[in-house]
Amino acid sequence: SQVSQNCHNGSYEISVLMMGNSAFAEPLKNLEDAVNEGLEIVRGRLQNAGLNVTVNATFMYSDGLIHNSGDCRSSTCEGLDLLRKISNAQRMGCVLIGPSCTYSTFQMYLDTELSYPMISAGSFGLSCDYKETLTRLMSPARKLMYFLVNFWKTNDLPFKTYSWSTSYVYKNGTETEDCFWYLNALEASVSYFSHELGFKVVLRQDKEFQDILMDHNRKSNVIIMCGGPEFLYKLKGDRAVAEDIVIILVDLFNDQYFEDNVTAPDYMKNVLVLTLSPGNSLLNSSFSRNLSPTKRDFALAYLNGILLFGHMLKIFLENGENITTPKFAHAFRNLTFEGYDGPVTLDDWGDVDSTMVLLYTSVDTKKYKVLLTYDTHVNKTYPVDMSPTFTWKNSKLPNDITGRGPQ
């Protein structure tokens, strides 16, 4: 139903959905703190620009009686219930910040007349791609997929002289929300990744994964998985691994690899870690006691959502344009704004762009070292270490299929 927006006459409200079912198990208090920090900065920026307006946030909580799984499984209905609550109260802000679960965002987008922008910290799945009024501030699955295809095809680097066209994907169903959708995208038969690969098999059991490590008849030397080093160790332990196996560990929201005192455990030597560049704000392990790096990224996405709204509000007010219009709703894309930790770039579809970093373990120093970076905005790989001290033969990544000659 048509809901009036509290979004005019110098008073601009942000509706923040505080959902019990969330992409990350983050206390709602921490998200409130992040939103309030963002509001303080936005108010200051607007004042500095000579815009004497009021910006506030309304936190919309669900009752939590029915939708209490805590993860994203029952988020679809929770999101719609919260929208119903907004509708009944006849109170909607200029922008909706909140749904982080792919299920809830997809359903809310489908079931509402979206004449207002929706900003999400999450919504990683492919089903949330290409939504005209949805902005995603954490790297969605599509960005990961494009990196992997780009990297697979690369064959002109000193350390990677073979194109790859095969892969195993380990996916056992216990993944975190981000990993679930990242792996889901790789598994999907209609996805870009599947389309570009000649062979891809999903390993669903621990034993399947463990057997592949030494199986002479394996169809690929490359295994993609998602999680942290501990997750890999639980699965792999100290088992022997064939010398031409390459494990790609997707661990985007974890900047602990970049800390000075971190030593890579021995079981990581066959592993390339894909993570995000820590950017401006690199936390010491002792620094953020209440927030793991992943959770800081989640709360930071809420904060940046507020700053993004402030950025757009400032532009529209300075141009004398109306906020409650489809033009405003569709404007949250193809731009760069000043985020909390530095500039944030959104692509043509409102998805955050970032620098992904591929790390390897140096056999000399037992430290994680940057092998290459990848700019999601231009879909381009930039080699960093031209002569890496790999565990692999001749300090080169092996072919993806054992016994196959140069490509």
């Epitope: 920026r45 010491n284 002792s286 620094f287 006691r289 927030l291 800081r296 709360a299 904060l303």
Partner: nanobody
């Protein structure tokens, strides 16, 4: 070990001035927004001022605007708060804090404005 150590508090008459300092260690100071937060007796913590990591943006609570100035010296890992035209309602323990996560707090420095 991450540490924030505030200093410079004291007793001052209404209309007087004080300069608070905060020495930071154990993290890369130049990468973080920093804030001053205060807590008056029997009240909750209240944000006073914040400054961006490179000093290019500074924001103030309405109650202190025009009287307080926040600044930083990244070379010295130090944060400052120049407080002028002090009033009785500025009496509080002043803390510096870093990052929006507000995970690390110093012991605070007490400012008492009294005639």
């Amino acid at each position: 070990q991450v540490q924030l150590v505030e200093s410079g508090g004291g007793v001052v008459r209404p209309g007087g001035s004080l300069r608070l300092s905060c020495a930071a260690s154990g993290f890369t100071f130049s990468r973080y927004w920093m804030s001053w937060v205060r807590q008056a007796p029997g009240k909750g913590r209240e944000w006073v001022a914040k400054i961006k990591y490179d000093g290019s943006e500074k924001y103030y609570a309405d109650s202190v605007k025009g009287r307080f100035t926040i600044s930083r010296d990244n070379a010295k890992n130090s944060l400052y708060l120049q407080m002028n035209s002090l009033r009785a309602d500025d009496t509080a323990v002043y803390y510096c804090a870093t990052d929006f996560t507000r995970d690390v707090w110093g012991q605070g420095t007490t400012v008492t404005v009294s005639s």
